[in-house]
Interface confidence: low
């Protein structure tokens, strides 16, 4: 037969197997003109692999317990006898009433996604039923699985889970929602409440619309031997051996111990559903015993031991050990010492491994000792305290507290501003502006250690040098930086901050704030020389405080202009001299001028300029200060707020008196006036005062 290339490409040529597993066919290739020699196409047939599922595919689980999946429940095999390690189950839809987990892996981890038949055989795949808050009699859950083992086709499987109080449960001897027993001090009475005995799960077997018409009837089949049961203060006896769930729920059942010893007591009962008007109805029932523990009223109470705070990072989980919660009680087993959460913090909750995912409010010392109790931190970063009550069931409950510290994953030292030290004081308190630690919140309990000290000073607390201090001391203004060496206008030091077990370092810069009064006033005229005097720069207060004459050193500027010393009188030889250093006395003597230049290379107009000065005085650190001023082209009609020693050349020409005065002519009579000279009478007054004097 002839087949074309296009038929092959189109997948239209099929091979149908029959007979032996090995075989094939011969073929030749031809393009119509040329024919190739013969070829053999070998075909090896493989037996088809089929997957099959055996086992009941149903699992019966006791309420609140963990049950392994077994080969009776789930048993996969393949026609090729595949290794169980290669038979893989994928969980398509997980359980709704519990969870599936691997015994060898963290039972608190994520939901199980896949597992092998070998793990089922080993009993490592566990279903855990989580107790719901509401009572139930029977509940059904399903797991949807997909079995795969290439090259076989996948097989879908459904595992049905029945959770029932009907089942005989070694882990849970009672078929009731609660049958915890009771403790009672010798010779005393105790109420039996639904916290100790509760058959509301029997009621849950009735459809909810009819539930209110039903009750559970308890029939006492064997009475307590050392005490008496009372319902609404009426004793139960052989002639009246019944009480109801509704009476239990209303707190009407009481056990009164008769005294004379601390032997165990209890009663046996049968519980079954009761229909409307007391009619007996078909439904779940159980026969059980209720244990009553009689305690010696003089027994020694448990002694709580000192507790170490639990520390963990937010969002994590940490086990609670005896370091956090333990008691000394020679006459109680760990399982008898019960804790109840009175108040929980907002930063997380307590959980029991195997006790469901939610928070627990009751647990025992045995839970702590076995490592089953853990704290689960939520996203909150605040510390918190559990207030607990602890009882051995005989003594009055005792208060205990469990502190939980949430550790930050990282902290940051915030430096909002350098520390400014007033020049005359030479010392200043640190504040939150300089040092403040934040993580995901403020850390008011941060501690600091000096890892690189300042060069020119000390850090002091209480007047004494220190290398360690706290945020609290900073906030109280107790941490002081003091200059000890008066040679620098700045300093720095490095600290290591520690908050809740995490550290970070930071550098604090220290600068000296000059004790200098600076008044630049309005704009200053370009091309003019103005007088620098205490109306512009004044370190008089520093002079008084240090009993010395403060000195200025010009560090920088002005960019357009210069500071000059002006001659005392016309007779004094020479013009103005460039100045780099001057004193407060020079300012007070009116010996200094500032030649305000014009910015070059651009059209005339307003501009800005500044002087940077270093101010020195005896016994205090130097400080850097700046005098910032605005300039504008000279305006003859404008009153300027400083004394002008000269005005621009052009302005004098306009006034009709060319060459009347040198640019830095001597100060006239007005120069000593504390008020600005030009401002007094405008331009003509200035000319009168300065040119015709």
């Amino acid at each position: 037969r002839t087949r074309s290339g296009s038929q092959l490409d189109g997948g239209l040529v099929l091979f149908s197997h029959r007979g032996t597993l090995d075989g094939g066919f011969r073929f030749r290739l031809s393009d119509g003109e040329h024919t190739s020699p013969g070829h053999f196409f070998r075909v090896t047939a493989q037996k088809q692999v089929l997957l099959s599922l055996k086992g009941s595919q149903t699992l019966t689980v006791c309420p609140g317990s963990v049950q392994p999946l077994s080969s009776q429940t789930l048993r996969a095999s393949s026609s090729a006898g595949t290794d169980p390690q290669l038979l893989l189950y994928r969980v398509v839809r997980g359980p709704q009433l519990g969870r599936l987990f691997h015994a060898q892996q963290d039972s608190t981890g994520e939901a199980l996604v896949n597992f092998t038949q070998a793990e089922v055989y080993a009993g490592n795949i566990l279903y855990e039923h989580e107790m719901p808050p509401e009572p139930f009699w029977e509940a059904h859950d399903t797991l949807e699985l997909q079995l795969s083992s290439p090259p076989a086709r996948d097989v879908a499987a459904t595992l049905a889970v029945a959770v029932s109080f009907e089942a005989a449960c070694p882990q849970r001897p009672s078929h009731l929602w609660k049958n915890k027993g009771l403790w009672v001090p010798e010779g005393q009475r105790a109420r039996i409440t639904v916290a100790a005995l509760d058959a509301s799960n029997l009621l849950a077997s009735v459809p909810s619309p009819q539930r209110s018409e039903h009750d559970v009837l308890f029939q006492v089949t064997q009475f307590p031997s050392r005490g008496q049961l009372l319902v609404s203060e009426e004793p139960l006896h052989a002639g009246q051996p019944h009480f109801l769930q509704s009476q239990l729920a209303a707190g009407q059942l009481v056990y009164a111990h008769g005294g004379g010893g601390t032997q165990q007591d209890g009663f046996h009962f049968r519980a079954h559903l009761q229909g409307p008007a007391g009619a007996s109805v078909a439904g779940p029932q159980t026969s059980e015993a209720f244990a009553i523990t009689v305690r010696d009223v003089n027994e020694r109470p448990p002694q709580p031991q000192a507790s170490v705070p639990l520390r963990l990072t937010r969002g994590s989980r940490a086990p609670i050990s005896r370091a956090q919660l333990s008691v000394v009680d020679p006459d109680s087993a760990p399982g008898e010492i019960e804790y109840e959460v009175q108040r929980a913090p907002h930063n997380g909750f307590l959980s029991l491994v195997g006790g469901g995912l939610g928070p627990v409010t009751r647990f025992t010392q045995a839970d702590v000792d076995s490592g089953r109790l853990a704290f689960v931190a939520n996203g909150s970063s605040v510390a918190g305290i559990f207030q607990l009550s602890m009882s051995d069931g005989a003594s009055p409950p005792l208060p205990m507290s469990l502190a939980v510290d949430i550790l930050p994953s990282a902290i940051e030292v915030q430096l909002r501003a350098p520390l400014e030290v007033p020049q005359a004081l030479g010392r200043s308190s640190l504040s939150q502006q300089q040092l403040r630690v934040v993580s995901d919140r403020e850390e008011p309990e941060a501690a600091y250690r000096l890892i690189q000290g300042p060069q020119y000073g000390h850090l002091l607390v209480g007047g004494r040098p220190t290398s360690a201090f706290s945020q609290f001391q900073i906030d109280q203004g107790e941490v002081v930086f003091a200059f000890t060496n008066s040679s620098s206008s700045h300093d720095h030091f490095r600290v290591l901050a520690l908050a809740r077990g995490v550290n970070a370092s930071a550098v604090v810069n220290v600068t000296v704030r000059a004790l200098l009064h600076v008044w630049a006033g309005g704009p200053w005229p370009q091309g003019a020389t103005l007088r620098l005097d205490p109306t512009v720069l004044d370190a008089g207060e520093l002079a008084n405080r240090t009993d010395s004459v403060p000195r200025f050193r010009l560090l920088e500027g002005p960019r357009h202009g210069r500071v000059v010393r002006v001659p005392r009188a016309r007779t004094e030889p020479g013009g103005s001299q460039l100045v780099e250093q001057f004193t407060q006395q020079d300012l007070e003597d009116g010996r200094l001028g500032l030649e305000v230049g014009r910015p070059e290379g651009r059209a005339p107009g307003p501009a800005g300029d500044s002087l940077t000065l270093e101010l020195w005085a005896q016994g205090v650190p130097p400080a850097v200060a700046s005098l910032d001023f605005a300039t504008e082209p000279y305006n003859a009609a404008r009153p300027y707020s400083v004394a002008l020693l000269s005005v621009p050349e052009a302005a004098r020409t306009e006034a009709g008196k060319p060459e009347s005065s040198t640019p830095t002519g001597e100060p006239g009579p007005m120069a000593s006036s504390p008020e600005p000279a030009v401002a007094k009478g405008g331009f003509l007054s200035f000319l009168e005062a300065n040119m015709f004097s």
Epitope: E340, P396, P399, S401
Partner: antibody, heavy 117, light 113 residues
């Protein structure tokens, strides 16, 4: 029976510190919290904080944080409350009270502290 | 902080009658985990320390006469004193013991005519 006996009245200058004691008897000292509550003349009750005599753990009201220190001496079943940087508004009767967690079942007789210059 | 507000500030009642004092908290003091209201009532007579009457909103402290009863849930609570006796003349305080700082109401002065 349960007894909490407090130290006697004190007069203090502003800025000074005071230390009031509270001696417990008639019960197991380490099993119950001791709280401090104060009452200014003619005013209501104000909770200051608690100490767990067993562990020494404390919890102070924010208002007194940094000024109050509560300590205990288990050998003498005594709790102490120290308040520093006193101001005139700290003039009050200071009570110690025993509790199971958070309500105050037994109280000391009270200690009047007067802050005056 | 939880703010406790009592009403009235004072009341005068004749012997043998009933007195009712109200207390309101700025947030619920019901602990949903154990369904208990963390509220206590105290009685204080001049020159004496306060005396515990009621805790958990309605549980009477042992030795307290059953004329005293507490009720309420969440944020609204009432102390009721039936058949008033002359010795009931005192100031009554409510206190939340749900969360620190534990806070008291401003007090209600009860006078017997």
């Amino acid at each position: 029976q349960v007894q909490l006996v407090q130290s006697g009245a004190e007069v203090k200058r502003p800025g000074a510190s005071m230390k009031v004691s509270c001696k417990a008897s008639g019960y197991t000292f380490t099993n119950y919290y001791i709280h401090w509550v104060r009452q200014a003349p003619g005013q209501g009750l104000e909770w200051m904080g608690w100490i767990n005599p067993n562990s020494g753990a404390t919890n102070y009201a924010q208002k007194f944080q940094g000024r109050v220190t509560m300590t205990r001496d288990t050998s003498t079943s005594t709790v102490y409350m120290e308040l520093s940087s006193l101001r005139s508004e700290d003039t009050a009767v200071y009570y110690c009270a025993k509790s199971w967690v958070s309500w105050f079942a037994s109280w000391g007789q009270g200690t009047l502290v007067t802050v005056s210059s | 902080d939880i703010v406790m507000t009592q009403s009235p500030d004072s009341l005068t009642v004749s012997p043998g009658e009933r007195a009712t004092i109200n207390c309101k908290s700025s947030q619920s003091v019901l602990n949903s985990k154990n369904n208990r209201n963390y509220l206590a009532w105290y009685q204080q007579k001049p020159g004496q320390p306060p005396k515990l009457l009621i805790y958990w909103a309605s549980t009477r402290e042992s030795g307290v006469p059953d004329r005293f009863s507490g009720s309420g849930s969440g944020t609204d609570f009432t102390l009721t004193i039936d058949s008033l006796q002359p010795e009931d003349s005192a100031t009554y305080y409510c206190q939340q013991h749900y969360s620190t700082p534990f806070t008291f109401g401003q007090g209600t002065r009860l006078e017997i005519k």
